[in-house]
Structures are given as structure tokens and as C-alpha cells.
Interface confidence: low
């Protein structure tokens, strides 16, 4: 808390300009009118204030707007946004996409902070729906935002929002989300050639059906084990040994290390042991020669 002190003679700020960087904290508190600050917020960002000075400016705005800042101030917060707490942001009513973009720009290149998460939550709730423009803005800044949406919300995502998604942005997506995202990615990338297509679609394959995996096995894609382990079990089970061998290419040897984990474990249980032996990896647990292939539901119960 900054003490209330009178402004020294001749130091009263008539406008927000660079001369203020030489003011001590108490002088800023005493000599800068909060209403003046609010109307000239756009200038603050261009002035190299110290963190301590920014704290004083924030304090002045908090006093002027105890119920929450108006959008005219919010849009021009710039780096002062980084000083806001989630509690501050919950008081705001942000309706303009331009305001959202301006604040996301401040945090660009960094992970989504609690402040940004709160801001997005307030914005989306304020709008009442996640429209295309909002979603496109959010995925442009935070492609990982997709994984925070429910499958129902994801169903309204246009294929065009998929282009910027990086592999790490899908790390937190669960299979139900990938089920929704995969067809959109397939649509967005379908005109790419084989190797480029695989690079782009790889992160989304946790939502791929069996027929698509079979098609990929014909394209020498050399899927790595990490990707294979994220595939839907029900999509992997119908694949033949030959198809998995083609799908993984040189990575097929990694199956041995994963033979006790899903989906490899469940897949092994569905294959004839003779076929597994052709891989030369020592995989055990396949169907002995001469036995019928068990019904899938019964197989699941046994495993």
C-alpha cells in the first residue's frame, strides 16, 4: 500500500508521457490522476516503466474501478495485463474480440497463464457461445486450447482451425476429443502428399479408424511406437501382423518392449501365434495354431 502524500509543486501530470519514468513510486501515486491514466492507457505500453511503477499504476486503476475495469481500459492494458490476477479479471466484462486479441498478444509465445485462462473463460461466457472467430483467434494463440474443449464444443470447430496445431498441443486431448478432431484434420490435410500428410496427421491419429490405419500401412510411413501406443485399441485390433509391420516399418522392433501394454497387449491376443512369430521378436500370447479367433468382446473379457 502506497502512502497518500501531496504531489510536489509543478509535478502534477498533465498527460501520460516518458517524463513519468523518473517519478518515484509515491510521486506517481500522488501526481497521476487515475482518470487521466484511464483515458491514456494506450500510452503506458510505449513507456519503459519499472515493475514497481506498474504496480502503482495498477493500484490507481483498482481504486478508480473497484467493480472491474471498463473495456476501454482493458483493451489498452498492454503489459499491465501481466500484473492482473485471475481475481481481477473475473470482475471484467470483455465482449470485443479486438480486446481479447490485444491481451493475448501480450502473452504471445508463453504458456497459457491462469490470467489468460480466466480471461478466455470470461470472454467465452460473456459471448454465450464459442463462435468461429473466437475459436480461430484462440487456436491461433493457443492451439492447445482445443484440448480444453468438450467433444460437443469441438464439433463446431472448422477444419481451418486445425492447420496450426503442433503435436505437443494435443498431448492433453483424450480419445473422445481426438475422435472429433481427427476427421477435421483429415479434411484439412487431405491434399498433401504422403509423407507430408503423415507428418501433419500423426498427432491426430488417436482418433483414426481401422480403415485409415490400413491405408497408412500401404504408404511406408514408419510410424513410431509413441504414436502407435496412442491409437484407439478398437482401431488397432483388426490390423493384421503384416499391416502392423508395414505401418511401423523399422520401428516394429519396439513392439517387444510394449507387449504388456495396451493396445499392443490386446492386439497380440488377437493374432495367430504363427503370424507373430514371423516378426522374429519373441512376442507371446497369440492364438495357438488350430484355434478359432475368439469373438472380440470375449477376448476383451479374458484380457
Amino acid at each position: 500500500e502506497v502512502e497518500k502524500t501531496a504531489c510536489p509543486s509543478g509535478k502534477k501530470a498533465r498527460e501520460i508521457d516518458e517524463s513519468l519514468i523518473f517519478y518515484k513510486k509515491w510521486e506517481l501515486e500522488a501526481c497521476v490522476d487515475a482518470a487521466l491514466l484511464a483515458t491514456q492507457m494506450d500510452r503506458v505500453n510505449a513507456i519503459p516503466f519499472t515493475y514497481e511503477q506498474l504496480d502503482v499504476l495498477k493500484h490507481k486503476l483498482d481504486e478508480l474501478y473497484p467493480q472491474g475495469y471498463p473495456e476501454s481500459v482493458i483493451q489498452h492494458l498492454g503489459y499491465l495485463f501481466l500484473k492482473m490476477s485471475p481475481e481481477d479479471i473475473r470482475k471484467w466484462n470483455v465482449t470485443s474480440l479486438e480486446t481479447l486479441k490485444a491481451l493475448l498478444e501480450v502473452n504471445k509465445g508463453h504458456e497459457m497463464s491462469p490470467q489468460v485462462a480466466t480471461l478466455i473463460d470470461r470472454f467465452v461466457k460473456g459471448r454465450g457461445q464459442l463462435d468461429k472467430d473466437t475459436l480461430d483467434t484462440l487456436t491461433a494463440f493457443y492451439p492447445g486450447y482445443l484440448c480444453s474443449l468438450s467433444p460437443e464444443e469441438l464439433s463446431s470447430v472448422p477444419p481451418s482451425s486445425i492447420w496450426a496445431v503442433r503435436p505437443q498441443d494435443l498431448d492433453t486431448c483424450d480419445p473422445r476429443q481426438l475422435d472429433v478432431l481427427y476427421p477435421k484434420a483429415r479434411l484439412a490435410f487431405q491434399n498433401m502428399n504422403g509423407s507430408e500428410y503423415f507428418v501433419k496427421i500423426q498427432s491426430f491419429l488417436g482418433g483414426a479408424p481401422t480403415e485409415d490405419l490400413k491405408a497408412l500401412s500401404q504408404q511406408n510411413v514408419s510410424m513410431d511406437l509413441a504414436t502407435f501406443m496412442k491409437l484407439r485399441t478398437d482401431a488397432v485390433l483388426p490390423l493384421t501382423v503384416a499391416e502392423v509391420q508395414k505401418l511401423l516399418g523399422p520401428h516394429v522392433e519396439g513392439l517387444k518392449a510394449e507387449e504388456r501394454h495396451r493396445p499392443v497387449r490386446d492386439w497380440i491376443l488377437r493374432q495367430r501365434q504363427d503370424d507373430l512369430d514371423t516378426l522374429g521378436l519373441g512376442l507371446q500370447g497369440g492364438i495357438p495354431n488350430g484355434y478359432l479367433v475368439l469373438d472380440l468382446s470375449m477376448q476383451e473379457a479374458l484380457s
Epitope: S160, A188, N191, M192, K200
Partner: antibody, heavy 121, light 108 residues
Framework: QVQLVQSGAEVKKPGESLKISCKGS????????IGWVRQMPGKGLEWMGI????????QYSPSFQGQVTISADKSISTAYLQWSSLKASDTAMYYC??????????????WGQGTLVTVSS | DIVLTQSPATLSLSPGERATLSCRAS???????LAWYQQKPGQAPRLLIY???KRATGVPARFSGSGSGTDFTLTISSLEPEDFATYYC?????????FGQGTKVEIK
């Protein structure tokens, strides 16, 4: 062969509306993004915006947002660029072009021949 | 927006000479998402190079692209008469995609 054919040159007065077209052939029109690029007389290339013909989802450059409208009719493999009220500064050559791979993830691999729009009173 | 600055603005060379065109980005263009186009007077641009170094279909081997990050180069190993034109670089990594201002290669 793969080509984009644009509508002919237009001469208009300020304040008039205009819609120019770009028809794709020789490939699956709905599988590729179509972009529009402006080239003012004697100047360089400026990216205006893009459309995904399947659902007509558009994305504009901030410089052109609200100034033009991009649309498409997938049934006739045609994309459009339109103005509701032309200005003299809209005088330029306008090119449509196809994105080779994905949205911004690709270069413009096929170009239309261009449509010259002249706005003069 | 990423600003692309091409240099030189004009390059005066004779047929058979080597042309080196530069394109510098104001910030890193990741994943080599940079293309080069050739435009002759009265014609539409034509894609030469994409992915910073991959030649587009039908582009002669004398055209090559290189570079990464913020510095990219288009090289024409031996100029043919039909190569005299204006060349533009374009980044398609960041939104919105942007073009350089162009380099005109003219006959000396």
C-alpha cells in the same frame, strides 16, 4: 490440366458494387483453399484472404477485413471476391490462387490469370 | 505481422551470370515455411520454390532456394533470357501470410 480462370477486366465508378469470379478446373475444387492476392499498379503482392470451399469458411488479412467479401459456390467450383462500395484506391490487379497444402501451411501453387479492376469517376 | 525485406531491389546481370536474391524476415519463419515466386510483366506470379528449398513442379534445376530462420536466399545458377523478371518471397508460417516487396532482375 489444373487451372483457375478469372472473370474479365472491370471498369467501375466509385461507390459501385462489384463481384469478380475465379473458376477452378482439373482438380477437386473443394479439397483446396483458394486465396486472393492484390497487386496495385507498379506495386508488390498483398495477401487478402482465403476460403475453404467445402463450408465457405473464410479468413481475412486484417488490412482487408470489412473491405471485401470472399465467398464460394462449390457446386460450380467458383470462388468470388466482392466489394459493396468501390473506391479509387481499389484499382488493382486481383489474383486468385490455390493453396498447395493446407491453410497457411502451403504456398500458392496455381494462379488465375488476374482480373484488372479500374475504379474511376 | 512478419515483414519480409528483399534485397537488392534491382539486380542488373547478363545472361549466364549467377543471381543471388536475399529475403530477410523480421522474425523467425519456422518450419521453413517460405516460398519464392517469379512474375513477368503482364503475367500472374508463378511458384518456384516452397518449403524454402523445394522446387515446384516443372521448375528448372538452375533455381534453388536455401536458408532458415530469418535469412533466405534464391539462387539462379546461370541466368537464361527468360529468367529476367521480378521475384517475390512469401512467408506462410505466421498469420497473415506476407510477401516481400520484390527484387527485379534486369538485363545489364
Amino acid at each position: 490440366q489444373v487451372q483457375l480462370v478469372q472473370s474479365g477486366a472491370e471498369v467501375k465508378k466509385p461507390g459501385e458494387s462489384l463481384k469478380i469470379s475465379c473458376k477452378g478446373s482439373g482438380y477437386s475444387f473443394t479439397n483446396y483453399w483458394i486465396g486472393w492476392v492484390r497487386q496495385m499498379p507498379g506495386k508488390g503482392l498483398e495477401w487478402m484472404g482465403i476460403i475453404w470451399p467445402i463450408d465457405s469458411f473464410t479468413q481475412y488479412s486484417p488490412s482487408f477485413q470489412g473491405q471485401v467479401t470472399i465467398s464460394a459456390d462449390k457446386s460450380i467450383s467458383t470462388a468470388y471476391l466482392q466489394w459493396s462500395s468501390l473506391k479509387a484506391s481499389d484499382t488493382a490487379m486481383y489474383y486468385c490462387a490455390r493453396y498447395g497444402h493446407g491453410m497457411y501451411g502451403g504456398a500458392l501453387d496455381v494462379w488465375g490469370q488476374g482480373t484488372l479492376v479500374t475504379v474511376s469517376s | 505481422d512478419i515483414v519480409l525485406t528483399q534485397s537488392p531491389a534491382t539486380l542488373s546481370l547478363s545472361p549466364g551470370e549467377r543471381a543471388t536474391l536475399s529475403c530477410r524476415a523480421s522474425q523467425s519463419v519456422r518450419s521453413s515455411r517460405l516460398a519464392w515466386y517469379q512474375q513477368k510483366p503482364g503475367q500472374a506470379p508463378r511458384l518456384l520454390i516452397y518449403g524454402a528449398s523445394k522446387r515446384a513442379t516443372g521448375v528448372p534445376a538452375r533455381f534453388s532456394g536455401s536458408g532458415s530462420g530469418t535469412d533466405f536466399t534464391l539462387t539462379i545458377s546461370s541466368l537464361e533470357p527468360e529468367d529476367f523478371a521480378t521475384y517475390y518471397c512469401q512467408q506462410y508460417y505466421d498469420f497473415p501470410p506476407t510477401f516481400g516487396q520484390g527484387t527485379k532482375v534486369e538485363i545489364k
